[in-house]
């Protein structure tokens, strides 16, 4: 893991360079001021202690300054995400300075050696920032370090070593191996900047987690639970990206953090919102769609500064590509039955009808099981803005469409063989929009017919704004 001692150590001695290139002494880190959106433009290389390039290249001392820090590389070249990010930053912040930190020679090595070089690179960035601070009008408050993978921890070291406090660090899927569980001074952590926000897109609880699982910032956002990213499955990758191997799936999911950040820069009008939650499972159940007390935030560049005492883990669902925004809904369905039906695992689908559009048929993901005579909470999300919801169609899937469903049906039958007429009653559905925080209640279209069974459907119409019904003493008590 990275070496523990402070910025005063003999850092150059730590460099893990291939023997062949140790002869010529050159700075191992270069700073390229990207002076054009054109990725082919060579930009300007900044040199510590040399003010002329700053003037010649139009470095704006009063503007925001972004430092983009790449991660470990197998190819030794800048990957294509880099110029996408540079271009997006230039588009969003026209006057900003966009600096690419080139530490390719130190990153194009065995992963363990590259990890051991992160501290040295962080120190180089800190020295550059210290030098810039000597200039009139340059403020660390305007500095935003954006580090991808191993680069996120480099940013952490830079923030730790610099004299003063940088304004912001964004960690884009910070690297996991050799950093998971590490001491705060040996990885990205909240004390490395005034505001540290993190996107986690490739975390795995089994096997190797390329991205770090633990929260390391003031806010840690886990899109799609931080693991399986839509559009990155083997089938998707085979069809749409170069190569089409497991390696590409890994790359797709790990790099998704960068694209989510780019999306937040270029699709300002379509911000994605994340919601605070203790874990991914609770989020999948639809429990965590509150915006009260800073419990929700925009993701990526638009994230609002939150400096909590504790790490804040936040979750959201996304589309498979840009724009990534989806619309989240919490659905509370009180399911009751007149007979004891034993363990029952219905496969429910909903279709939402709105003033702008209608949703596709959406599955209600049952995270654990359906509780009878109780309120069940679900999360559904749509790719399009439906507008104001008007009605909901709830369907209980009939004939099994998969081996899993067939097994569910069989298991259900074996537990209750003498109960062929499986039937549940649902009188109303309560819906809350994550994006608008609006609460609505939908009542069964036919109050006399609230029963649903396999292969059947129920229709619900909006019957009031808000959740409390007239004559209702408590929202949790449902009378048949």
């Amino acid at each position: 893991s990275p070496t523990p001692f402070g910025p005063e150590g003999q850092l150059e001695d730590e460099l893990h360079k291939p023997k062949a290139i140790q002869t010529e002494v050159k700075p191992s880190v270069r700073f390229n001021l990207r002076t054009s959106k054109d990725p082919e433009h060579e930009g300007c290389y900044l040199s510590l202690g040399h003010s002329q390039p700053l003037e010649d290249c139009g470095f704006n001392m009063t503007a925001k300054t972004f430092f983009i820090i790449h991660g470990w590389t197998m190819s030794g070249i800048f990957e294509n995400w880099l110029h996408k990010l540079v271009s997006a930053l230039h588009t969003r912040e026209k006057d900003a300075n966009v600096v690419v930190v080139d530490w390719l020679p130190l990153a194009h090595q065995l992963y363990t050696d590259a990890v051991n070089n992160t501290r040295v690179v962080g120190h180089s960035i800190a020295r550059m920032l210290d030098w810039l601070q000597e200039k009139d009008d340059f403020s660390l408050e305007n500095v935003h370090l954006i580090g991808y993978s191993l680069g996120a921890h480099v940013a952490g070291y830079a923030g730790n070593f610099v004299k003063g406090t940088v304004g912001r660090i964004t960690g884009l899927d910070p690297a996991g191996p050799m950093f998971e569980g590490a001491d705060i001074h040996k990885r990205l952590s909240p004390d490395d900047a005034d505001f540290v926000d993190v996107l986690h897109t490739y975390t795995r609880s089994f096997g190797l987690s390329i991205g770090i699982q633990m929260p390391v910032g003031h806010i840690d956002i886990y899109p799609n639970g931080g693991d399986f990213q839509p559009g990155c499955g083997l089938n998707d990758v085979l069809g749409s990206m170069a190569y089409g191997t497991i390696t590409e799936v890994v790359k797709c999911e790990h790099e998704r953090a960068v694209h989510l950040f780019v999306d937040s820069l270029v699709n300002q009008d379509k911000p994605s919102f994340a919601f605070q939650c203790t874990d991914s499972n609770r989020f999948k159940k639809g429990i965590c769609l509150s915006c009260r007390k800073n419990r929700c935030n925009s993701i990526g560049y638009n994230a609002k500064k939150m400096r909590n005492k504790r790490n804040s883990k936040m979750y959201l669902k996304t589309r498979a590509g840009m724009p990534f925004r989806v619309y989240h809904y919490q659905m509370k369905i009180h399911v009751f039955s007149y007979k004891n039906m034993g363990e029952i695992e219905p496969t429910f689908y909903v279709t939402l009808y709105g003033t702008n559009a209608d949703s596709q048929t959406l599955p209600l993901e049952i995270v654990e099981r359906i509780e009878q005579n109780a309120t069940n909470t679900f999360l559904v999300y749509t790719e399009e803005d439906l507008g104001d919801l008007l009605k909901i169609q709830l369907t209980w899937e009939g004939a099994s469409q998969s081996w899993y469903n067939l097994w569910k049906e069989l298991r259900s039958y074996l537990s209750q063989p003498h109960n062929p007429g499986r039937e549940l009653n649902i009188r109303r559905i309560r819906v809350k929009s994550g994006e608008t925080q609006r609460k609505l209640t939908f009542c069964a279209e036919d109050p006399e017919n609230t029963s649903i069974s396999p292969g059947r459907e129920l229709w619900f119409r909006k019957c009031r704004d808000g959740w409390r019904m007239k004559n209702e003493t408590s929202p949790t008590v449902e009378l048949p």
Epitope: E24, N32, V100, P105
Partner: antibody, heavy 120, light 112 residues
């Protein structure tokens, strides 16, 4: 203007070592990567690999690992290709070509080529 | 490695007509909306010359009669109207994130 000027043609005996040069001018040498491309007589182009002109770190295509070596003389803005234990199948024209580190990696300027021929 | 297959291997086109050269990749060379496919022209005794990069972008100084199109695995170079000086061999090349960067086998264009 931007130019890549390569050393002249050479006749080599099998087993010998040959080193060809590619001198860059008109741009900052260390700001662009340098590729090497082989073209056997009457055949197509084959990418051999590239060298980071700033760090000196070379990357070789699988078919060119072992007997081939890329190197630099940064002060002279020159890249070199060395072929050890020259073989008959090394008879070809070798091109150097630069690419932008920051862009889409296409080869925008090429050297005129150096013809290497095996003599028996 | 990504294999690029060019077709036809050679073609003869009358002056002023359209020449169409195809390049098929064994896997997609697309990345986030961009296609990492380039086209080069090579005349006998000369080095290759870049014509088109990122599938459809014309390099400055190259005549507008050259155009590129395609995405994913299928790409096309069009020359219209063909001129005498366009007689050459044309190569496609992919430059995706991870080398090796490969070339197609080449298409020899003859002017009738």
């Amino acid at each position: 203007q931007i130019q890549l000027v390569q050393s002249g043609p050479e006749l080599k005996k099998p087993g010998e070592t040959v080193k060809i040069s590619c001198k860059a001018s008109g741009y900052t040498f260390t700001n662009y990567g340098m590729n090497w491309v082989k073209q056997a007589p009457g055949k197509g182009l084959k990418w051999m690999g590239w060298i980071n002109t700033y760090s000196g770190v070379p990357t070789y295509a699988d078919d060119f690992k072992g007997r081939f070596a890329f190197s630099l003389e940064t002060s002279a803005s020159t890249a070199y290709l060395q072929i050890n234990n020259f073989k008959n199948e090394d008879t070809a024209t070798y091109f150097c070509a630069r690419f932008s580190y920051y862009g889409r990696h296409y080869f925008d300027y090429w050297g005129q080529g150096t013809a290497l021929t095996a003599s028996s | 490695d990504i294999v690029l297959t060019q077709s036809p291997a050679s073609l003869a086109v009358s002056l002023g007509q359209r020449a169409t050269i195809s390049c098929k990749a064994s896997q997609s060379v697309d990345y986030d909306g961009d296609s990492y496919m380039n086209w080069y022209q090579q005349k006998p005794g000369q080095p290759p010359k870049l014509l088109i990069y990122a599938a459809s972008n014309l390099k400055s100084g190259i005549p507008a009669r050259f155009s590129g199109s395609g995405s994913g695995t299928d790409f096309t170079l069009n020359i219209h109207p063909v001129e005498e000086e366009d007689a050459a061999t044309y190569y496609c090349q992919q430059t995706t994130d991870d080398p090796p960067w490969t070339f197609g086998g080449g298409t020899k264009l003859e002017i009738k």
